[in-house]
């Protein structure tokens, strides 16, 4: 999906209002410095591409993030503010249901959510401090 035509201001507002709090709750008890940055993004559409990938694509060591509250709200936000997004996700959602696994908050999941927080922070920081 090409995130170029999303309403970035509305997505940012949703993130600040709800998604960020759910991510922080998930990370509770973990310091942000516990994990190094292993993923970045270079503009707002790119950030959303990487956020979608980390949130919804199961990995061998962290398969359950898509069922978390922050993931559900992320999905709703993207569906609301990115034209045509929900249509592209129907097949992906059906495939995900077949691979559901037992919910365990592993250290790898914490690391992945830490990376997500970093990507969202880059998304809402539209410009560097200086040019």
């Amino acid at each position: 999906y090409d995130f170029t035509n999303c309403d970035f201001q509305k997505i940012e507002a949703d993130y600040l209002r709800t998604i960020s709090k759910d991510l922080i709750t998930y990370m509770s008890g973990t310091k942000s410095t516990d994990f190094n940055n292993t993923v970045s993004c270079s503009n707002r559409p790119h950030c959303l591409t990487e956020i979608q990938s980390l949130t919804f694509n199961p990995t061998p060591r962290c398969a359950s993030l898509a069922k978390e509250m922050f993931a559900r709200k992320t999905k709703a936000t993207l569906a609301l503010w990115c034209p045509g997004y929900s249509e592209t996700q129907i097949n992906a959602t059906q495939a995900m249901k077949k691979r559901r696994k037992r919910k365990v908050t592993t250290n790898k999941c914490l690391e992945q959510v830490s990376q997500l927080l970093g990507l969202w922070r880059r998304f809402i920081r539209t410009l560097l401090k200086k040019q």
Epitope: N37, T38, V39, C41, S42, R122, L128, K130
Partner: antibody, heavy 122, light 108 residues
């Protein structure tokens, strides 16, 4: 563990070519800008080139423009530097380094490789 | 093109504060990064975006930037801080990375 490992250095005659490679692991390579930086024996750091996270743009130092080409293969997590028409003054340790970028702005180089030595001598 | 000027050497007594400067035209309008390089080793990022510090770098390292000078400050200097230090910026006008010439820090 995040790591960059350079290879391909060696001794080469002036006017000849050499190709350096940098293998990345432990991070999502496709999301970072990648640089080559060199250091001549006993001298300071000299930036050589940078390639955008998606390979769409490249920028070069004036001293290597037209002779060196930086490329990346995001499917293989590798960065390359093709060096043509080598000169004695290209003798240096060559480092690859990653940096986040925001639009056309490159940020600090937070991960560096250990370097590979290139000697240009007849 | 843009030029960054550093003193070739700076000395500090153990336990004292070392300040390494990096001069450039209106450098305060740019983000400055600092690297430490020990002999035979690759550079290590110690301060980025003027004053931010990677999580693995001790709080003794700090930075500031305004006007025509950026400064790396190393408090409570230790023998292990002996190294070359380089400032660096991204020059948007020319799309080039620029490094300072480097400063050799000696802990007396």
């Amino acid at each position: 563990q995040m790591q960059l490992v350079e290879s391909g250095g060696g001794v080469v005659q002036p006017g000849r070519s050499l190709r350096l490679s940098c293998a990345a692991s432990g991070f999502t390579f496709r999301t970072y800008g990648m640089h080559w930086v060199r250091q001549a024996p006993g001298k300071g750091l000299e930036w050589v080139a940078v390639v955008w996270y998606d390979g769409s743009y490249t920028h070069y130092a004036d001293s290597v423009k037209g002779r060196f080409t930086i490329t990346r293969d995001n499917s293989k997590n590798t960065l390359n530097l093709q060096m043509n028409s080598l000169r004695a003054e290209d003798t240096a340790v060559y480092y690859c380094a990653r940096s986040p970028q925001w639009e056309e702005i490159f940020e600090a180089m937070d991960i560096w490789g250990q370097g590979t030595m290139v000697t240009v001598s007849s | 093109s843009y030029v960054l000027t550093q003193p070739p050497s700076v000395s500090v007594a153990p336990g004292q504060t070392a300040r390494i400067t990096c001069g450039g035209n209106n450098i305060g309008s740019k983000s400055v990064h600092w690297y430490q390089q020990k002999p035979g080793q690759a550079p290590v990022l110690v301060v980025y975006d003027d004053s931010d510090r990677p999580s693995w770098i001790p709080e003794r390292f700090s930075g500031s930037n305004s006007g025509n000078t950026a400064t790396l400050t190393i408090s409570r200097g230790e023998a292990g801080d002996e190294a070359d230090y380089y400032c660096q910026i991204w020059d948007s006008s020319s799309s080039l990375v620029v490094f300072g010439g480097g400063t050799k820090l000696t802990v007396l």
